[in-house]
């Protein structure tokens, strides 16, 4: 997982309804000039991408770890 930036917000709605075991990769988009909220995009094992709620209990700690120190890309 990496901290990324988008050119605008890409998630209007989010879901909590995905099992962590379905996730193959996690992208965290930090707050920046182009988007005023943290966005989390999960790549699923079925090839789809979905927007996850950053406040979901199973995600909060993971996101904090990534934002605090992770592999930073801009």
């Amino acid at each position: 997982a990496a901290v990324l930036r988008e050119l605008r917000c890409v998630c209007l709605q989010t879901t909590q309804g995905v099992h962590p075991k379905m996730i193959s990769n996690l992208q965290v988009f930090a707050i920046g000039p182009q988007c005023s909220k943290v966005e989390v995009v999960a790549s699923l094992k079925n090839g789809k991408e979905i927007c996850l709620d950053p406040e979901a209990p199973f995600l909060k700690k993971v996101i904090q770890k990534i934002l605090d120190g992770g592999n930073k890309e801009n």
Epitope: L7, C9, L12, Q34, K37
Partner: antibody, heavy 126, light 107 residues
């Protein structure tokens, strides 16, 4: 009926604030971004910012960031745009417009604004 | 911030003629370019979204093309009600930006 209905015209003095409302009806409020765009007399279109009806988080054009606040009331499907420290150059028609629909799949192919309010004329004059 | 340049500023044509309007972006915006029509005293109306996709209720004489930085709106045969100002707008990135407009007037 699918529509965005805005509040009426306003006349304000320099330095004052104005709050314009935009009431959505006839569609799923949370599936569309709401943008605010203004147009000064005889001029082009200028994007002020937008708001997510879901989270209430707003994104502002840097030009207006210190003076604009966008909020929403999900119980009435209404979005508000407040502009403070008004000056004569803020005299314009202010439009709200929706962009979407989007679900919880991230999109990088974006819709245009397919529904616009009727516009609210804000006149700033001493 | 992206800059959208529309040309020409004014297009003088007769009903029945073909209109070609151009919009150039200062950097690539993928296909996230949309076209709007505005008549005096009215709100803008979306004609074409995502470069070339048609909008419900918009006549088939309106079409769009292009990609990256160069985009075109074509009106195949002008009707009297088509004389108006046309704006391109991009939302590939925020801030969203509009071009300065092209006025299509009766010759």
């Amino acid at each position: 009926q699918v529509q965005l209905v805005q509040s009426g015209a306003e006349v304000k003095k320099p330095g004052a604030s104005v709050k314009v409302s935009c009431k959505a009806s006839g569609y799923e409020f949370t599936s569309y971004w709401i943008h605010w765009v203004r147009q000064a007399p005889g001029q082009g279109l200028e994007w002020m910012g937008n708001i997510s009806p879901n989270s209430g988080s707003a994104n502002y054009n840097e030009k207006f960031k210190s003076r604009v606040t966008m909020t929403r009331d999900t119980s009435t499907s209404t979005v508000y745009m407040e502009l403070s420290s008004l000056r004569s150059e803020d005299t314009a028609v202010y439009y709200c417009a929706r962009e979407g629909p989007y679900s919880y799949y991230p999109s990088r192919q974006y819709y245009g604004s397919d529904l616009w309010g009727q516009g609210t004329l804000v006149t700033v004059s001493s | 911030e992206i800059v959208l340049t529309q040309s020409p500023a004014t297009l003088s044509l007769s009903p029945g003629e073909r209109a070609t309007l151009s919009c150039r972006a200062s950097q690539s915006i993928s296909n996230n370019l949309h076209w709007y029509q505005q008549k005096p005293g009215q709100a803008p109306r979306l004609l074409i979204y995502y470069t070339s996709r048609s909008v419900s209720g918009i006549p088939a004489r309106f079409s769009g093309s292009g990609s990256g930085t160069d985009f075109t709106l074509t009106i195949s045969s002008l009707e009297p009600e088509d004389f108006a100002v046309y704006y391109c707008g991009q939302n590939n990135e925020w801030p969203e930006v509009f071009g300065g407009g092209t006025k299509v007037e009766i010759k």
